[in-house]
Interface confidence: low
């Protein structure tokens, strides 16, 4: 056996961030036409040695690990062989696992819009966050003439929320606005972590 | 109309393990929310235990990750809890329960929580 | 975690009381708090949530302030139905908590 594309295969020292995909590759050829096989830390890789197990593109001569996470941590070495010999490769693999953090809104937005009556106005948050982020869009409303209840704290109106009926939950779209619209709009973003919100004015 | 059921069995001895299933009916498990079990104490305090969202992704109380697994089988639209080493501590109604997101505020439908006792 | 500290347990009421309950938090919760009533032998009912938003066909004797560290539920006229436990809860911080409970009984 021989390996066809060593290009491919340089890059033996692999830092993946935990969740990501992992693909290692070990194009080969031969007459007869090799095999593949694939082991970790000098053993047999089986497919019960990781949560959700692995894929193997015989096709493409690579291995496939979907949501890595810390315990996939070593080397895995691809052996190619026929009946005149094998060939083998080593890549190392580390999870590197962040800190998830609360999520981080970008300076600036949403933006403070202004529009005639009649117009239509975007308001756009960008978020950051390593953790699933839900979004929300809030705005101070008027309850029986009043904008604060007998606390003294607004009213609040939630217009729109990340899941399952919002799409582009980042954008709030308002169209043909009136001057009930004018106001504060809040962009509100939760993960497991904490929350983070920013606002813009309507005018 | 939207119904979680519990189910499961009502006597644990110590020591043991504790597997509940929540069956979900007229809302796919897959499609939103995110899936909690609650648990309410005699004296009535509540404890959040933990949940598995919509993308299969689990969140669990600290006090209990060692011993909590949430998991689902999607064909059936149903979660499960599995609570290892038991004490009688864990003598509890247990509710599953299900919440838009995390940040939302609201456990929306409850289902009607399942006694469990754990004694030798 | 973040803790909860409902009072009070008890309130011992007469049909058509204004009663309030409060829930301080150790730390700020922005306005991510609910408010739950549990009838005996029955799951909790979600009535409030974001502080002061009534969830759909919850009568409007019952209201929700607050932000921050600082809740307050309150019945207006209490009816006969409304004998139950309530509960705070907060989910702006994993873990989820929930307030010990305040327990409506007739005077």
């Known amino acids: 056996p021989y390996w066809t594309n060593t290009e491919k295969m340089e890059k033996r020292l692999h830092a993946v961030p935990a969740a990501n995909t992992v693909k290692f590759r070990c194009p080969a050829g031969g007459n007869p036409m090799p095999t593949m096989r694939w082991l970790k830390n000098g053993k047999e890789f089986k497919q019960e040695h990781r949560i959700g197990g692995y894929k193997v593109r015989n096709q493409h001569w690579s291995l496939i690990m979907e949501s890595v996470v810390p315990s996939d941590k070593g080397n895995y070495t691809c052996v190619v062989e026929n009946e005149y010999g094998s060939i083998n490769h080593t890549y190392h693999l580390d999870v590197v696992e962040r800190s998830p953090h609360r999520p981080i809104l970008q300076a600036g937005l949403p933006a403070n819009a202004s529009t005639v009556v009649g117009g239509d106005v975007e308001f756009v948050c960008k978020v950051y966050s390593d953790a699933q982020p839900h979004i929300q869009w809030i705005k101070h409303v008027e309850k029986n003439g009043s904008k604060y209840g007998p606390d003294g704290l607004p009213y609040l109106k939630v217009l729109k929320h990340s899941g399952i009926n919002s799409s582009n939950a980042e954008v709030l779209a308002l169209f043909n606005v009136t001057e009930a619209d004018a106001g504060e709009y809040i962009c509100k973003v939760s993960n497991y972590i904490g929350q983070a919100n920013q606002s813009a004015w309507l005018t | 109309d939207v119904h979680l059921q519990e189910s499961g069995p009502g006597l644990v001895k110590p020591s043991q393990s504790l597997s509940l299933t929540c069956s979900v009916t007229g809302y796919s498990i897959t499609s939103g929310y995110y899936w909690n079990w609650i648990r309410q104490f005699p004296g009535n305090k509540l404890e959040w235990m933990g949940y598995?969202?919509?993308?299969?992704?689990?969140n669990y109380n600290p006090s209990l990750k060692n011993r909590l697994s949430i998991t689902r089988d999607t064909s059936k639209n149903q979660f499960f809890l599995q609570l290892s080493s038991l004490t009688t501590e864990d003598t509890a109604t247990y509710f599953c329960?299900?919440?838009?997101?995390?940040?939302?505020?609201?456990?929306?439908?409850w289902g009607t929580g399942t006694t469990v006792t754990v004694s030798s | 975690s973040i803790v909860m500290t409902q009072t009070p347990k008890i309130l011992l009421v007469s049909a058509g009381d204004r009663v309030t309950i409060t829930c301080k938090a150790s730390q700020s919760v922005s306005n991510d708090v609910a408010w739950y009533q549990q009838k005996p032998g029955q799951s909790p009912k979600l009535l409030i949530y974001y502080a002061s938003n009534r969830y759909t066909g919850v009568p409007d004797r019952f209201t929700g302030s607050g932000y921050g560290t600082d809740f307050t539920f309150t019945i207006s006229t209490v009816q006969a139905e409304d004998l139950a436990v309530y509960f705070c809860h907060q989910d702006h911080t994993s873990p989820f908590t929930f307030g010990s409970g305040t327990k409506l009984e007739i005077k």
């Open positions: 329960a299900r919440v838009y997101y995390y940040g939302s505020g609201n456990f929306d439908v």
């Open positions: 598995i969202t919509y993308d299969g992704s689990n």
